[in-house]
Interface confidence: low
């Protein structure tokens, strides 16, 4: 919890520079994002593919959009949830980070040195020893976090199901439901190849609690669909004389204490026969 | 191979203060964190704090904050702890160690150990 | 702090005889629990990280079990050269935290 208050932004007076003075995480341990680079990454054959079960949401059922003043959050069924970890993680939401038209690479963890157009985090929480992803937050290893990388490319109708209510949700506060879909479609080609590291959430509180799994292959989203993202919201409440376009709403990299990430692919690509010619 | 270097012991007046020295070598200095460890006589280990030499970045016990100052020089891949205001309580054996890599937390090589005597 | 609490200060065994020396933390740290030894001249080394992981050049007879709150060191057969004091340490969050070492003499 803070120590007092919960003002936080990206950008001004209570941007990320500030965030630990009323969240003292945020300038603790395990801090995330971070930086992908060869120097920390080692390969390790005991990270399995992951299995996502219960993903498939029902069309029949709606799950609740929300501008949060931070993001655009999706909540998810608690049924939804990860096999393969040494917990059952359940889902909890899902939102995203950005940058701005101007600037579009706004993903919060970079692969050597170099952003993404933006991020998806599906949040899900220990639910073999926790009752809801609140208590969870702030016990080790409490939520695991899966991560995609999002670049500019081809139309990507499954963001679409999202993105297509973005216009419902302009300001903070307001609310909109989506109807079901298949959320591993959100999830990029080779799931089986990932990067892990234990680190935190990259918010305040800044809970130092997070299993990341970022994976490796990103997945495109439209040159409109990335506009639309970063162009539709705001931070600030409809009747707020001063609005805030939501852009820009991801953590610079933090600073990667004495661990390693593993991967659970070994570093060299496979040079396909397109790629010698 | 990987070697931590401590300097000699030390007997200092109370209130003075006293620097030791840790000299590493056999491996990259600016890759590891290097951690200080403080025994007083007949106890047990207890963590004074860590220091990133990469960019000195120093992470202290709270209970050693007020009077523990930690640096390095990267140019001799050595570091330094001062202990100031020393009382006997200050009285000790310390140990520099080297953070292993790999997010264990664990400290994988250890100095001979400097003995500090805080006397009149 | 975590609360690191090694129970047994000190403990008599043969040269021979399986020793477990025991660690308990004040809370779960997910398995964050490395050992040390320290000769009677002082000279310290890690001996298994992570609970079970063994360091570099330490014997096969040094292995490491627990989970959650509770854990262990485990010497399969005491040879004279492991005298010594046995500490754990929790890397789990700082400050780090060590035991109050467990004191391991020849019968």
């Known amino acids: 919890a803070p120590v007092n208050g919960s003002k936080w932004t990206y950008f001004g007076p209570d941007g990320e520079n500030s965030w630990s003075k009323k969240y003292p995480s945020c300038g603790g341990l395990l801090q995330s994002p971070i930086d992908l680079h060869s120097d920390i990454l080692q390969y390790d054959a005991s990270l399995t593919p992951l299995e996502f079960q219960g993903y498939n949401l029902s069309a029949n059922k709606q799950f609740l959009l929300t501008n949060n003043g931070h993001s655009v959050k999706l909540n998810l069924p608690s049924d939804m949830h990860i096999q393969g970890l040494q917990s059952r993680y359940s889902a909890t939401q899902l939102h995203l980070h950005w940058g701005n038209p101007n600037d579009p690479h706004g993903s919060e963890h970079t692969v050597s040195g170099q952003h993404f157009a933006a991020e998806l985090h599906i949040v899900h929480y220990n639910s073999d020893l926790y009752p809801d992803a609140s208590t969870a937050s702030n016990k080790s290893e409490g939520l695991a976090v899966l991560a995609v990388l999002i670049e500019m490319g081809s139309f990507n109708p499954s963001y679409d199901k999202i993105f297509s209510h973005l216009q419902h949700v302009k300001y903070k506060g307001q609310e909109a439901f989506v109807p079901g879909f298949n959320i591993e479609e959100l999830l990029p080609e080779r799931t089986a190849e990932y990067y892990r590291y234990r680190g935190s959430l990259t918010t305040p509180p800044c809970n130092p609690t997070v299993l990341w799994t970022v994976f490796r292959n990103p997945v495109q989203i439209s040159q409109e669909q990335l506009l639309a993202l970063e162009t539709a919201l705001y931070c600030t409440h409809m009747d707020d004389p001063s609005p805030r376009e939501m852009i820009n709403n991801f953590r610079q990299v933090q600073k990667f204490d004495e661990r390693l990430v593993y991967t659970s692919f070994s570093q060299v690509q496979v040079c396909t026969a397109a790629g010698l010619s | 191979q990987v070697q931590l270097q401590q300097s000699g012991p030390q007997l200092v007046w109370p209130g003075a203060s006293v620097k030791i020295s840790c000299n590493t070598s056999?491996?990259?200095?600016?890759?590891?964190?290097i951690h200080w460890v403080k025994q007083r006589p007949g106890q047990g280990l207890e963590w004074i704090g860590m220091?990133?030499?990469?960019?000195?970045?120093?992470r202290l016990n709270q209970k050693f904050k007020d009077k523990t100052t930690l640096t390095v020089d990267r140019s001799s891949s050595t570091a330094y702890m001062q202990v100031s205001s020393s009382t006997s309580e200050d009285s000790a054996v310390y140990y520099c160690t080297r953070g292993i890599r790999g997010g264990y937390y664990a400290m994988d090589y250890w100095g001979q150990g400097t003995s500090v005597t805080v006397s009149s | 702090d975590i609360q690191m609490t090694q129970t047994t200060s000190s403990l008599s065994a043969s040269l021979g005889d399986r020793v477990t020396i025991s660690c308990r933390a004040s809370q779960d740290i997910s398995n964050y629990l490395n050992w040390y030894q320290q000769k009677p001249e002082g000279t310290v080394k890690l001996l298994i990280y992570y609970t079970s992981r063994l360091h570099s050049g330490v014997p096969s007879r040094f292995s490491g079990s627990g989970s959650g709150t509770d854990y262990s060191l485990t010497i399969s057969n005491l040879e004279q050269e492991d005298i010594a004091t046995y500490f754990c340490?929790?890397?789990?969050?700082?400050?780090?935290?060590f035991g109050e070492g467990t004191k391991l003499e020849i019968r």
């Open positions: 220091i990133d030499p990469s960019d000195s970045e120093t």
């Open positions: 340490q929790q890397g789990d969050t700082l400050p780090r935290t």
């Open positions: 056999g491996y990259s200095f600016t890759n590891y964190w």
